[in-house]
């Protein structure tokens, strides 16, 4: 697994531990919390990166606080259980046996149960909506220079292949970014579009999971893109099971 | 390969304030955390305070609030610590640290002394 | 705050013997601890951080073991370029160091 050898850390995830003990003393790291072993050229699975961050040092909440733009973090933390590939397993339970289904960024996606839930098999979110509110700014961005700028920024911060940067729609001061994967197009190695919102998501809160990379610094000719809002939106490769009772509340 | 520079020798009256600067190169300046540690004669290693480059926000040690104020410049990737209201006490060589992702401090200055005499 | 308690606070050993110094933190930090090398005139050295984990270059004499409150630093067989004061540091919740253990050679 490629990780920088000369002081032996992940460039890619700063919340593993790295030691020169692979073989023949190559370094290798591992994630917090799961012990996994990671791949340090590509980014790691949301699954494992939940999983650190439930274990990750105190200093990782208190001395990194969220930039001033950032949302209010309700995204559900919880400690998930992971496959052996670093993938969420379809069903999720806490230390009370309370149980349910989750898609493939963790995101529940049927009521609540205890264990007797059966979760059948990961369904795959294939279709994820960043809605983008940008702070005011003299004038709007130019619509094709922005475009070009966030098709950049995956490609090259999150590795993303720009086929699955499916549109970037923009109507000041709302950018909205739609990545698209179904199970098909996905091929070995890509970078699933699950992890690389993720990663944007922890990016634009400050909190970015790259080690030694400064925050976000995204410019669009030059003109700073601060972003003030987001919101960001899964869709199921099969839509998601609650009870009508949840619908109407 | 990653340095960490500091500014050399001072020597203080009582009352009085020093700054000392740390300059850093060799790794991106915004993407790790620097800190600042005590080292009294005779003494153990104290952990003084810390700052994140990249936003400049700073948590201090209780013991030494009010004492220091530490900043950054990003332009030329130096952090600076002022120690105000200078006694005796304050005697000591004073080291910053970088702060790996973990936090741990994994490169160091190679320390600056500070005299307070009258 | 979190209190590191170090010992012994010195130590005489002979080249060649198994060095043990302990540090034992007020609550439970995980396995955020490292160990540091400090010489006179020198800027500490990281050694071993994640309790046992050793940092790149750092001789495979040098161990460390523990979890929760409790953290042995072993040197298997001292040398004499290993006379230096030890520290802990734990980086769970904010940073303390431990008082030092200062290592004298026989």
């Known amino acids: 697994h490629t990780a920088a050898q000369d002081n032996c850390t992940c460039p890619t995830n700063k919340m593993t531990v790295c030691s020169p003990d692979g073989p023949g003393g190559r370094c290798q790291c591992r994630a917090l919390g799961s012990g996994m072993a990671v791949d340090c050229s590509t980014l790691t699975s949301k699954c494992l990166l939940l999983k650190a961050r439930m274990s990750a040092p105190k200093n990782a909440r208190t001395l990194v606080r969220p930039s001033e733009h950032a949302l209010v973090d309700n995204d559900g933390l919880y400690d998930p259980d992971c496959d052996p590939e670093g993938r969420f397993k379809a069903r999720q339970c806490n230390q009370t046996s309370v149980c349910w289904c989750v898609n493939s960024v963790g995101v529940r996606r049927t009521d609540k149960g205890d264990l007797s839930l059966r979760c059948d098999e990961l369904v795959r979110t294939h279709h994820i909506l960043i809605d983008l509110r940008h702070r005011p700014t003299a004038g709007a961005f130019n619509h094709s220079d922005l475009d070009a700028e966030l098709r950049r920024l995956f490609r090259e911060r999150y590795r993303l292949h720009p086929k699955f940067v499916a549109a970037v729609h923009y109507e000041q001061p709302t950018i909205q970014i739609e990545l698209r994967q179904n199970t098909s197009q996905k091929a070995a190695g890509d970078v699933d579009i699950g992890d690389a919102a993720y990663y944007f998501e922890r990016d634009i809160k400050g909190e970015s999971l790259f080690q030694g990379r400064g925050g976000l610094d995204l410019r669009v000719r030059g003109e700073p893109l601060q972003v003030e809002r987001t919101l960001i939106y899964y869709l199921d490769e099969i839509p998601p099971k609650f009870s009508m009772k949840r619908l109407t509340a | 390969q990653v340095q960490l520079v500091q500014s050399g020798a001072e020597v203080k009256k009582p009352g009085a304030s020093v700054k000392v600067s740390c300059k850093a190169s060799?790794?991106?300046?915004?993407?790790?955390?620097m800190n600042w540690v005590k080292q009294a004669p005779g003494q153990g290693l104290e952990w003084i305070g810390i700052?994140?480059?990249?936003?400049?926000?700073?948590t201090y040690n209780q013991k030494f609030q009010g004492k220091v104020t530490i900043t950054v410049d990003k332009s030329t990737s130096t952090v600076y610590m002022e120690l105000s209201s200078l006694r005796s006490e304050d005697t000591a060589v004073y080291y910053c640290?970088?702060?790996?992702?973990?936090?741990?401090?994994?490169?160091w200055g190679q320390g600056t002394t500070v005299t307070v005499s009258s | 705050d979190i209190q590191m308690t170090q010992s012994p606070s010195s130590l005489s050993a002979s080249v060649g013997d198994r060095v043990t110094i302990t540090c034992q933190a007020s609550?439970?930090?995980?396995?955020?601890l490292a160990w540091y090398q400090k010489k006179p005139g020198k800027a500490p050295k990281l050694l071993i951080h994640?309790?046992?984990n050793l940092q790149t270059g750092v001789p495979s004499r040098f161990s460390g073991s523990g979890s929760g409150t409790d953290f042995t630093f072993t040197i298997s067989s001292l040398q004499p370029e290993d006379i230096a004061t030890y520290y802990c540091?734990?980086?769970?919740?904010?940073?303390?160091f431990g008082q030092g253990t200062k290592l004298e050679i026989k």
């Open positions: 540091l734990q980086y769970d919740d904010l940073f303390t």
């Open positions: 994640y309790t046992s």
């Open positions: 060799g790794s991106s300046f915004t993407g790790y955390t």
């Open positions: 640290a970088r702060g790996a992702g973990l936090y741990y401090f994994d490169y």
């Open positions: 609550q439970d930090i995980n396995k955020y």
């Open positions: 700052i994140n480059p990249y936003q400049g926000d700073t």
